[in-house]
């Protein structure tokens, strides 16, 4: 449906509060280095303009596209060239190229200081003094650090952030009330950002067919009682929502997401019995709830798939008539029967089936050729099952920190060219799969583990794309979205890698080590571990364990000493010498 003024249409649909929040998020995700005040000024100007268009849709410039309006506004920033360099060249382009140019300059790893959490009283004072500015600051700080954060979901996080302060700043023990809530929001926010980043990578690098396949599999697991036509409609709508958000069209995205939530709640009976409690909630909470809803129960007595997908003489005819519909139905039927499989496994199975049909439907006797297609599925199913079993056993044996260290060693040996901070970040997150998934019942382990690993490995791919250093990483990241995890799992020690020269400075530590939090201490030790492996890629587990144990003992000893700095200065070189000897 066309509107005379797109900006007026979105302002009216979304309301002023959400409109302003989304415009702030959009601008902060594009211009990640701009100061807060600059963004607030731009947002206020856009909002005032939108109000004039609401009053009179035929007023000057009201007929312009949102990209044109927002792009023009971004290009008024005076310091664009100094702050962003070549991104300023985007402003010389016309739409739609200008928006594409802005999108390409989004930085997944912006050079921004880590967010420091002030004292609780300081935060509560700021919250009470100017609640609106306090919440805008939250949107701005999260959005600029996470340029692909799912914007309507970020509004939901901001609402929870507000609720936490409103409740806890009145509490007797403000800190005890507030800090766990902020920790939870931080951790959930990071997870939400990473999940959305995979959706955007899927759309941008592999196209909407890849995203639609992912969505068919996931929604069929969630809504196994829904008909294929219903799942297909939801997939089409969801693809539009995510395409818009990943493309920076945040107003359209939020509006369409609200429409999708409305549709789902109006059609619960043909979708899922689990939607009821979501549908009574206010909009932001409702959309979040629907996205996270648990899988509905599978219908009883679903027939074997062999009749329609192997035994039927019409398989090739049905496939040829509408390939994507036929494969979509295959994926739907398989996924609704297997909530115990990861989405990535289901997509591999569909891919294997597609490859078999491509080969067999051109053969002399197609039926004979594809008659045993499902025998090819068994190894595909058993590989992630075994991987989850082995890694959960290792996690239970080692605990999280040592499990992360095992993964750090494993991945550094596979791709030693990758920067140490990236290897530490990615391996630490890979290691979190244990605590997240291994405690779950067996039926939930594989979908939890493999789909989480896909999200973490996407972070490696995104960071590596910015600064490519390893052909093996490029290959695993670009060849096949669904085979990324198996591709990385299959990598062995890189024999071509020339070990990094030893640098004593890398292994020099100071008394400031003692004041670090437990997490920061772990990161320091894990950074040293990666550097050790880069120096001696063929070091054995036992050798590395010995060095790391000595390292922990050395740090503990010096942190107990009266003159800590003197201890580090004296014991440090001894530790380095002993480590070199142990790894020789």
């Amino acid at each position: 449906d066309t509107h005379k003024s797109e900006v007026a249409h979105r302002f009216k649909d979304l309301g002023e509060e959400h409109f302003k929040g989304l415009v702030l998020v959009a601008f902060s995700q594009y211009l990640q280095q701009c100061p807060f005040e600059e963004h607030v000024k731009l947002v206020n100007e856009v909002t005032e303009f939108a109000k004039t268009c609401v009053a009179d849709e035929s007023a000057e410039n009201c007929d312009k596209s949102l990209h044109t309006l927002f792009g023009d506004k971004l290009c008024t920033v005076a310091t664009l060239r100094e702050t962003y360099g070549e991104m300023a060249d985007c402003c010389a382009k016309q739409e739609p190229e200008r928006n594409e140019c802005f999108l390409q300059h989004k930085d997944d790893n912006p050079n921004l200081p880590p967010l420091v959490r002030p004292e609780v009283d300081v935060m509560c004072t700021a919250f009470h003094d100017n609640e609106a500015t306090f919440l805008k600051k939250y949107l701005y700080e999260v959005a600029r650090r996470h340029p692909y954060f799912y914007a309507p979901e970020l509004l939901f996080f901001a609402a929870r952030y507000k609720a936490a302060f409103a409740e806890c700043c009145q509490a007797a023990d403000k800190a005890a009330c507030l800090l766990p809530k902020l920790d939870e929001l931080r951790d959930e926010g990071k997870a939400s950002s990473a999940k959305q980043r995979l959706k955007c990578a899927s759309l941008q690098k592999f196209g909407d067919r890849a995203f639609k396949a992912w969505a068919v599999a996931r929604l069929s697991q969630k809504f196994p009682k829904a008909e294929f036509a219903e799942v297909s409609k939801l997939v089409t709508d969801l693809t539009k929502v995510h395409t818009e958000c990943c493309h920076g069209d945040l107003l359209e995205c939020a509006d369409d997401r609200a429409d999708l939530a409305k549709y789902m709640c109006e059609n619960q009976d043909s979708i899922s019995s689990k939607l009821k409690e979501c549908c009574d909630k206010p909009l932001l909470e409702k959309s979040h709830c629907l996205a996270e809803v648990e899988n509905d129960e599978m219908p009883a007595d679903l027939p074997s798939l062999a009749a329609d997908y192997v035994e039927s003489k019409d398989v090739c005819k049905n496939y040829a008539e509408a390939k994507d519909v036929f494969l979509g139905m295959f994926l739907y039927e398989y996924a609704r029967r297997h909530p115990d499989y990861s989405v990535m496994l289901l997509l591999r199975l569909a891919k294997a089936y597609e490859a078999t049909l491509e080969k067999c439907c051109a053969a002399a006797d197609p039926h004979e050729c594809y008659a045993k297609v499902f025998d090819e599925f068994q190894p595909l199913v058993e590989e992630p099952q075994n991987l989850v079993k082995q890694n959960c056993e290792l996690f239970e044996q080692l605990g999280e920190y040592k499990f992360q260290n095992a993964l750090l060693v494993r991945y550094t040996k596979k791709v030693p060219q990758v920067s140490t901070p990236t290897l530490v970040e990615v391996s630490r997150n890979l290691g979190k799969v244990g605590a997240k998934c291994c405690k779950l019942p067996e039926a939930k382990r594989m979908p939890c583990a493999e789909d989480y690993l896909s999200v973490v490995l996407n972070r490696l791919c995104v960071l590596h794309e910015k600064t490519p250093v390893s052909e093996k990483v490029t290959k695993c990241c670009t060849e096949s979205l669904v085979n990324r995890r198996p591709c990385f799992s299959a990598l062995e020690l890189d024999e071509a890698y020339v070990p990094k020269a030893f640098n004593a400075e890398t292994f020099t530590f100071h008394a400031d080590m003692c004041t670090l939090s437990e997490k920061e201490k772990q990161v320091k030790k894990q950074t040293a571990l990666v550097e050790l492996v880069k120096h001696k890629p063929k070091a054995t587990k036992e050798q590395l364990k010995g060095v790391m144990d000595n390292f922990a003992a050395f740090v503990e000893k010096c942190c107990k000493a009266d003159d800590k700095e003197a201890c580090f200065a004296e014991e440090g070189p001894k530790f380095v010498a002993a480590s070199q000897a142990a790894l020789a």
């Epitope: 899988n295 599978m298 074997s304 062999a306």
Partner: nanobody, 116 residues
């Protein structure tokens, strides 16, 4: 195909407990739903309890709160823990496997008799 073998049946007094096991072999990778059915003399075969691939369970009203179904995918076994048994629970108990790629499979059955 999937092959199923039940064990654990026997004679038990009212109020007692029994634990039935079903060992699956063959193409177990393709199983989605496992279930226990029972057939009393002269009656039709009825569902007792079902557990899906996602772990969700469903029980016949007559056994709710007394019977518990569980599955161990690693060991390929289905278990039915039966407590507070009643004479009307007397029947032949059959293990059932629904497969994604193969026809459904039934075990041979194991007799459960509840009598004082």
């Amino acid at each position: 195909q999937v092959q199923l073998v039940e064990s654990g049946g026997g004679l038990v007094q009212p109020g007692g407990s029994l634990r039935l096991s079903c060992a699956a072999s063959g193409s177990t990778w393709s199983i989605n739903t496992l279930a226990w059915y029972r057939q009393a003399p002269g009656k039709q075969r009825d569902l007792v309890a079902r557990i899906s691939s996602g772990g969700s369970t469903h029980y016949a009203d007559s056994v709710k709160g007394r019977f518990t179904v569980s599955r161990d995918n690693a060991e390929n076994t289905l278990v039915l823990q039966m407590n507070s048994l009643k004479p009307e629970d007397t029947a032949v108990y059959y293990c059932y496997a629904q497969s994604t790629w193969y026809p459904p499979s039934w075990g041979q059955g194991t007799q459960v008799t509840v009598s004082s």
